[in-house]
């Protein structure tokens, strides 16, 4: 699901107050929640009947380092006797989500958000045909 | 997929430096690669044969505000004649995600992240049966 | 660890109904569905209703739609299945799972055997 564009209003502070200096903000050290978990059936990919793949992708400069990546395996769904069946299609599920990027430059550390774009998962659908003009 | 804990290194300077003044961080204002968008199939939760809905949860003090999570609409999945085969389980997808959640008191206003599950949309599987005491 | 305990099977003559009851206790009980399945000697298990906890979803298999209803009681923590209509082929073992994490169906009851004649 998409991300709306800022917009330059959440992150200003009211009207009536003096402006944020040098276009930064305060952000609090911590994560609230930060100990939630995902809680998905086990081996989810593999037992899917769209089933993916997943590729990790490191960045020590982001938070989080680690961003995972699905890639469904087939084009086609997996019936019931196992085999790939091409009138239904594996098709990617995608979040866009948010990342901290840390920019330094010697002792001066400062963050940026970034919107990056996440496939989660892989889910079976009936494929659209359109009509030949 | 899971977020890290934050392990007070990633936001923190270098050793060598002075530390973070009250516990807090300079963010940046605007967003990287704010334009990038999901490109999914067309009405994907309808025609999966684990199909969902979506529910919007909207908080003016987060970024982004609305959050949308998805619901699977059925236990069993939508087999070729359209009836539900509960042989086979639709299953949520849950993601990891980052929000910006903004606290103030009058002009003073700070930022923190905020870690929340998202239920991004539903896969049908092969359910495990664990054998009978 | 959950514990699932199922009551109310029995012997019942064709047409008859009976409601199996399933009692969920243990630490910190939170199940994203709970079911029941059956086996009959010789054949398969197989799924014949299941609920989900949050808001009360519900699926059957085909063979038992109209005839069973499944239903929960959160504050008793028990799970139910109404059968009405019940047919010699309904004869089986019924089993209460529990699913904590989504089509993992790791807590089952002992079972309770149900036995239609005609």
């Known amino acids: 699901r998409k991300i709306p564009k800022v917009g330059h209003t959440f992150f200003q502070k009211p009207e009536s107050c003096p402006p944020v200096p040098g276009g930064s903000m305060k952000l609090d050290i911590g994560i609230i929640n930060e100990n939630q978990r995902v809680s998905m059936s086990r081996n989810i990919e593999s037992r899917s009947t769209s089933p993916w793949n997943y590729t990790v992708t490191w960045d020590p400069n982001r938070y989080p380092s680690e961003v995972v990546q699905a890639q469904c395996r087939n084009l086609g769904c997996i019936n019931a006797q196992g085999k790939e069946d091409i009138s239904m299609n594996s098709v990617p599920i995608q979040q866009e989500t948010l990342v901290v990027r840390r920019k330094h430059q010697g002792c001066s550390v400062s963050f940026q958000l970034e919107k990056v774009l996440v496939t989660v998962g892989c889910t079976c659908v009936t494929p659209v045909i359109h009509h030949v003009q | 997929r899971k977020i890290p804990k934050v392990g007070h290194t990633f936001f923190q300077k270098p050793e060598s430096c002075p530390p973070v003044p009250g516990g807090s961080m300079k963010l940046d204002i605007g967003i990287i690669n704010e334009n990038q968008r999901v490109s999914m199939s067309r009405n994907i939760e309808s025609r999966s044969t684990s199909p969902w809905n979506y529910t919007v949860t909207w908080d003016p003090n987060r970024y982004p505000s609305e959050v949308v999570q998805a619901q699977c609409r059925n236990l069993g999945c939508i087999n070729a004649q359209g009836k539900e085969d509960i042989s086979m389980n639709s299953v949520p997808i849950q993601q990891e995600t980052l929000v910006v959640r903004r606290k103030h008191q009058g002009c003073s206003v700070s930022f923190q992240l905020e870690k929340v599950l998202v239920t991004v949309g539903c896969t049908c599987v092969t359910p495990v049966i664990h054998h009978v005491q | 660890e959950v514990q699932l305990v199922e009551s109310g099977g029995g012997l019942v003559q064709a047409g008859g109904s009976l409601r199996l009851s399933c009692v969920a206790s243990?630490?910190?009980?939170?199940?994203?569905?709970m079911g029941w399945f059956r086996q009959a000697p010789g054949m398969e298990r197989e799924f014949v209703a299941l609920?989900?906890?949050?808001?009360?979803?519900?699926g059957y298999v085909d063979s038992v739609k109209g005839r069973f209803t499944i239903s929960r009681d959160n504050a008793k923590n028990t799970v139910y299945l109404q059968m009405n209509s019940l047919k010699p082929e309904d004869t089986a073992v019924y089993y209460c799972?529990?699913?904590?994490?989504?089509?993992?169906?790791?807590?089952w009851g002992q079972g309770t055997q149900v036995t239609v004649s005609s």
């Open positions: 609920i989900r906890w949050s808001d009360g979803i519900t």
């Open positions: 799972a529990a699913a904590v994490r989504p089509g993992d169906y790791d807590y």
């Open positions: 243990g630490r910190a009980f939170s199940s994203y569905v």
